[in-house]
């Protein structure tokens, strides 16, 4: 056969799988002789043991026989199967040859494995002997497990293959093998050709792109040729029949299987993989040995073969960068007007939805960030007491507040409401004061003097004061936020000099002080300053952090206090506080 390599003719420059604008387009591997250089398994080869064979020639009416020896052990006299698929030089023909006179019902088979699916255009055999009287070509699409007929040749189709002679091919039966008597002449006695064209006479051949039936019909992983009956001159049963019988055998100089590596229009070449198997070098986001499926995460539309008009590339699922996996749902694809059928799986970053395109319950969209951002969804942080639920408005982040509660996270009482001790109704209406008494506002108390003594900031620290309090800590005020009836200070606890039953840890914590205490400057506290805080254990609104009130001591920090406080700490450990 012609020595075309599988990989020959690959142009280096333009990409066959995309156009000049970079858009995908159909691409197909080069047309090759898929049989070239491949091993052919044969059921019979002459020469083991060495045997005589005779070649018949004709001169006018006269029949001449020249006899030779076939010897498999002598390279000069051997006719091995390798000669079927070697370089076919018409000036130096090499022929595979079967044993003599394997006549019907015995047959001789040639089996060629292509190693992968090919789209076969033709199967041809060039003979050194006369062509067979009956012969069948079969194909396998499953690597030789099952075989289906491709074509039959016989002068007696019905008798040999139980097939009608030259049955018409219609759209209804175009994927069926037919039987013909063409190419079955005994002459020429040598050099005759049998060529089967897979699409010849098939009605849909002109519209091959749109004919799944014919696409299937031309697909093969293996080809088998079965020689069923030898042509004879009718002298094989005469007295001197041994010479005649030695003249009848099958001999083939060239077996060709013309076609292309099957890649469904999604690859321009086939290559060897790590296992040395032939596979398509898939493009258009496809995968598989025949580019017959979409590669992972490219399931937004169903896999389709490329056509001359449409590349039908696989499309990535749109998961807005929040999912790594998706699956195809045909019904959703159809419902979308055949645009998108990918369903994202396991949306991350607190997103949800078919495309991970909205925030999951308990989160809302940060409109300052694109939906593809890792932090596009922010936690609602609805106040556990003030909010009526954990789900907030997807766009504004507003939590559903209980009666009388306000704020985006429902963390403070609305105007005209005051904090209660009930978690069910955390804010209750401020009772309207009778006309005789002056109504007092929680926000700005009118009589701070009667409420508490504002610290002047020059307080002294002694053992007695240290012992009276449950905890003593050095704090750095970082920021302050209003939270209903409370102020929430974010503080950094630098040192812990005393702690009660609730363990106080160093690091960032919340310090809670009632709004009224702050309004009356008991204690007086400013952000970004460092303080010594002595206070009593009390439950904070968020069940963590510490509480200070009008009875707490908050004194601007002096470094000289560190040693004194360590002393107090040691004394306390020795039980001195109980005496004090």
């Amino acid at each position: 056969g012609p020595g075309l390599s599988m990989f020959a003719g690959q142009a280096a420059q333009p990409d066959p799988c995309s156009d000049e604008n970079g858009h995908p387009r159909r691409c197909i591997p080069d047309f090759v002789n898929a049989a070239f250089g491949k091993d052919v398994r044969v059921s019979s080869t002459c020469g083991r043991p060495p045997a005589r064979y005779c070649v018949v020639s004709e001169r006018g009416e006269e029949r001449l026989r020249s006899c030779h020896l076939c010897n498999a052990s002598d390279p000069k006299k051997a006719h091995p199967p390798a000669f079927l698929t070697d370089l076919n030089n018409p000036h130096n023909l090499t022929c595979w040859q079967s044993e003599n006179y394997l006549q019907f019902p015995h047959n001789v088979t040639l089996t060629l494995s292509l190693g992968k699916k090919f789209e076969v255009t033709y199967v041809s055999l060039q003979f050194c002997s006369p062509r067979p009287e009956s012969m069948a070509i079969y194909k396998s699409m499953d690597y030789g497990r099952t075989w289906v007929p491709f074509q039959f040749y016989s002068t007696q189709c019905r008798k040999m293959y139980n097939r009608p002679h030259r049955a018409p091919i219609t759209k209804q039966n175009e994927q069926e093998a037919v039987c013909t008597d063409s190419h079955t002449d005994m002459r020429p006695l040598s050099g005759g050709l049998i060529a089967f064209s897979t699409l010849d006479g098939r009605p849909s051949a002109h519209d091959f792109d749109n004919s799944p039936v014919l696409q299937d019909w031309v697909t093969a992983t293996d080809i088998r040729v079965a020689f069923s009956r030898l042509h004879t001159f009718g002298d094989e049963n005469e007295d001197d029949s041994e010479l005649a019988r030695d003249s009848y055998f099958y001999a083939v100089s060239d077996l060709q299987v013309g076609g292309r590596c099957k890649c469904n229009g999604h690859a321009a070449r086939c290559v060897r993989d790590r296992d040395d198997s032939l596979v398509c070098d898939c493009r258009h986001n496809t995968a598989g040995p025949e580019c017959d499926r979409c590669k992972p995460f490219h399931y937004d539309r169903p896999w389709q073969r490329a056509t001359a008009r449409e590349a039908n590339e696989c499309v990535a699922c749109n998961c807005n960068l929040h999912a790594r996996r998706c699956r195809f749902n045909m019904e959703l694809y159809k419902l979308s007007g055949r645009k998108s059928g990918g369903v994202c799986l396991n949306c991350r970053h607190n997103t949800a939805g078919r495309h991970c395109h909205y925030c999951k319950e308990g989160y809302y969209r940060d409109m300052g960030k694109p939906i593809t951002h890792r932090k596009a969804c922010k936690a609602c942080d609805c106040h556990p007491v003030g909010a009526a639920g954990k789900t907030c408005n997807q766009t504004t982040g507003q939590c559903p507040c209980k009666d009388g509660v306000t704020g985006i996270t429902c963390n403070r009482c609305a105007k005209g409401y005051q904090q209660s001790r009930s978690p069910i109704a955390p804010c209750i209406k401020i009772p309207v004061a009778p006309p005789t008494t002056a109504a007092s506002s929680v926000e700005e108390p009118e009589d701070c003097d009667s409420y508490c003594k504002a610290s002047k900031g020059k307080l002294k620290i002694n053992m007695k004061k240290y012992c009276k309090k449950d905890y003593a800590v050095q704090i750095h005020i970082l920021k302050a936020d209003k939270a209903g009836d409370w102020w929430k200070f974010t503080v950094n606890i630098i040192s812990v000099y005393k702690q009660g039953t609730s363990r106080i840890r160093r690091g960032d914590q919340s310090l809670w002080i009632r709004s009224r205490d702050i309004a009356c400057k008991c204690p007086k506290i400013k952000p970004l300053k460092k303080y010594l805080l002595l206070g009593n254990a009390e439950d904070s609104p968020d069940q963590s952090g510490i509480v200070a009130d009008k009875s707490s001591l908050v004194i601007q920090w002096r470094d000289t206090w560190a040693r004194r406080l360590r002393k107090f700490q040691q004394r306390e450990k020795k039980g001195k506080c109980k005496k004090a």
């Epitope: 019904e331 959703l332 159809k334 007007g337 055949r338 369903v343 939805g353 078919r354």
Partner: antibody
């Protein structure tokens, strides 16, 4: 076995809203689309819309857009359909049906 | 919307007959066609999906064929229990549409 159990009022007055429920059992609710189809007396079938309970995606027949709402509750494996602003032409038997390859399973209507 | 036109609108047959119902789509719907049988007071029952696949439990006398725009439901050797309304339906493109039955 697969079952689709429908419930809802037998009769709704014009201009009001029809609310129907379809409770499923026997398969994974989130794996199949749930469709709503109606059939006026003595007439053919008409597709109203569908929901993919896996993520709440809906698709509606344009003819009903704005009047129909289909929802699903994964926790109870139940689909719901509401059709508002009812008129006399909306008189029909309403079915829920499981999607897939054809409507193999239907509610009783 | 894709229109599905069924014919004939009604027909009568004798037990053992072969009956053919056709359905024509207003545009190509590939093989995305299903056939249903409906008896009075009952929900429809799926017979055929993807134009030619018989649904589980449907007797072999029911068969479907067609591709593109022309589809056929054939009932061979018809039985008295087959008296019913028959609908075709396309699910090629939203909105899903049915034949008039």
């Amino acid at each position: 076995q697969v079952q689709l159990q429908q419930s809802g009022p037998g009769l709704v007055k014009p201009s009001q809203t029809l609310s129907l429920t379809c409770a499923i059992s026997g398969y994974t609710f989130t794996s199949y689309n749930m469709h709503w189809i109606r059939q006026p007396p003595g007439k053919g079938l008409e597709w109203i819309g569908a929901i993919y309970p896996g993520n709440g995606d809906t698709s509606y027949n344009q003819k009903f857009k704005g009047r129909v709402t289909i929802t699903a509750d994964k926790s109870t494996s139940t689909a719901y359909m509401e059709l508002s602003s009812l008129r006399s032409e909306d008189t029909a038997v309403y079915y829920c049906a499981r999607g897939g390859t054809g409507f193999a399973y239907w509610g009783q209507g | 919307d894709i229109q599905m036109t069924q014919s004939p609108s009604s027909l009568s047959a004798s037990v053992g007959d072969r009956v053919t119902i056709t359905c024509k789509a207003s545009q190509s719907v590939s093989n995305d066609v299903a056939w249903y049988q409906q008896k009075p007071g009952q929900a429809p029952r799926l017979l055929i999906y993807y134009a030619s696949n018989r649904y589980t439990g449907i007797p072999p006398r029911f068969s479907g064929s067609g591709y593109g725009t022309d589809f056929t439901l054939t009932i061979n050797n018809i039985e008295s229990e087959d008296a019913a309304y028959y609908f075709c339906q396309q699910d090629y493109s939203s909105p899903w549409t049915f034949g008039q039955g």
